[in-house]
């Protein structure tokens, strides 16, 4: 009686279980009653990452420099190329098909987490006691200057965008 299901790494064709091709190889001929499945390795810039019965290998992803992409990991016959973004840019999606410029944190905000090739800058508002007076993708919130440690007094209070202004103590 012909099989209705096959073992792992096999496929059913013409009422027969044939071996799948190993990762990195494509199918050129199905098995028959007398012959095994025939496979062939994928060519350069091609891959198949699973046990398969594909008659064509997939093309490696192209990391288009015009989209800000570069190769992070070169593909093999069993793996796709992994793209990442050029310095100062990050991927717009998990598939990393294009890049956008890292966001800068506005004055009053500091960098909580510096951007990577796959994630954008994370900003946080500067809490009381801290400030940021620049728009930056790298600068954290800086603590206000401590006037006391310089034997000075606060002449102008700090904000989330400005440092305190220190001045000499009034002499009586």
């Amino acid at each position: 009686e012909p099989p209705t299901a096959c073992r792992e790494k096999q496929y059913l064709i013409n009422s027969q279980c044939c071996s799948l091709c190993q990762p990195g190889q494509k199918l050129v001929s199905d098995c028959t009653e007398f012959t095994e499945t025939e496979c062939l390795p994928c060519g350069e810039s091609e891959f198949l990452d699973t046990w398969n019965r594909e008659t064509h290998c997939h093309q490696h992803k192209y990391c288009d420099p015009n989209l800000g992409l570069r190769v992070q990991q070169k593909g093999t016959s069993e793996t796709d190329t992994i793209c990442t973004c050029e310095e100062g840019w990050h991927c717009t999606s998990e598939a990393c098909e294009s890049c956008v410029l890292h966001r800068s944190c506005s004055p009053g905000f500091g960098v909580k987490q510096i951007a990577t090739g796959v994630s954008d800058t994370i900003c946080e508002p500067c809490p009381v006691g801290f400030f940021s007076n620049v728009s930056s993708a790298f600068e954290k919130c800086h603590p206000w200057t401590s006037c006391e440690t310089k034997d000075l007094v606060v002449q102008q209070a700090g904000t989330n965008k400005t440092d305190v202004v220190c001045g000499p103590q009034d002499r009586l």
């Epitope: 091709c21 050129v28 001929s29 028959t32 025939e38 496979c39 390795p41 060519g43």
Partner: antibody
Framework: QVQLQESGPGLVKPSETLSLTCTVS????????LHWIRQPPGKGLEWIGV???????DYNPSLKSRVTISKDTSKNQVSLKLSSVTAADTAVYYC???????????????WGQGTLVTVSS | DIVMTQSPDSLAVSLGERATINCKSS????????????LAWYQQKPGQPPKLLIY???TRESGVPDRFSGSGSGTDFTLTISSLQAEDVAVYYC?????????FGQGTKLEIK
């Protein structure tokens, strides 16, 4: 025993189509694929293409637009057609049996004696 | 396409001596999943078709004398004839059977010194 025999005209005019037949015995074309290879006089070997036992074909990209390989299993024959020939296509044309060794490994284990085709007006 | 380059183009060796032919591929012929190298060697005597000697770099075809051996990995391969016999005079071709289009080296002519 395994035998392969190429046949066809020895002289073809430029711009015409070269047509060759490979007749095999001692094995079945449903069990083994068949390659065509050529060798210009005094030069090296160039792979033209293959018809796999399942009937799929693969061609050399340098010839793909001009080449067709087909088979008639009942007659144990494989044909090669190469269109728009020029003097550069003058060569000994061989057919060779494909052998599959598992793990995606293929080689040409039996060859015909070859037939010389000259392209000239 | 994978380009195959053989060296030397011709070689003269004394009877009984060792003959070595080299073959280089433009890309690796090592399949990372199964760790096999897809390289074959053929022998062509004058007026005859090529004859398969070796496949998968080092596996001798049935009936091939054991004085013929193959080695190498990745992009660099060698055919060695351990003790040259008169009947070994021929042109030797390496061929990658990694993927289509299958490609051959330009050939190495082996003669007796």
């Amino acid at each position: 025993q395994v035998q392969l025999q190429e046949s066809g005209p020895g002289l073809v005019k430029p711009s015409e189509t070269l047509s060759l037949t490979c007749t095999v015995s001692g094995f079945s074309l449903t069990t083994y694929g068949l390659h065509w290879i050529r060798q210009p006089p005094g030069k090296g070997l160039e792979w033209i293409g293959v018809i796999w036992r399942g009937g799929n074909t693969d061609y050399n990209p340098s010839l793909k637009s001009r080449v067709t390989i087909s088979k008639d299993t009942s007659k144990n024959q494989v044909s090669l057609k190469l269109s728009s020939v020029t003097a550069a296509d003058t060569a000994v044309y061989y057919c060779a049996k494909n052998s599959y060794y598992g793990d995606g490994g293929h080689a040409m284990d039996y060859w015909g004696q070859g037939t010389l085709v000259t392209v000239s007006s | 396409d994978i380009v195959m380059t053989q060296s030397p183009d011709s070689l003269a060796v004394s009877l009984g001596e060792r003959a070595t032919i080299n073959c280089k591929s433009s890309q690796s012929l090592l399949h990372s999943f199964n760790q096999k190298n897809y390289l074959a060697w053929y022998q062509q005597k004058p007026g005859q078709p090529p004859k398969l000697l070796i496949y998968f770099t080092s596996t001798r075809e049935s009936g091939v004398p054991d004085r013929f051996s193959g080695s190498g990995s990745g992009t660099d391969f060698t055919l060695t004839i351990s003790s040259l016999q008169a009947e070994d005079v021929a042109v030797y071709y390496c061929q990658q059977h990694y993927t289509t289009p299958f490609t051959f080296g330009q050939g190495t002519k082996l003669e007796i010194k």
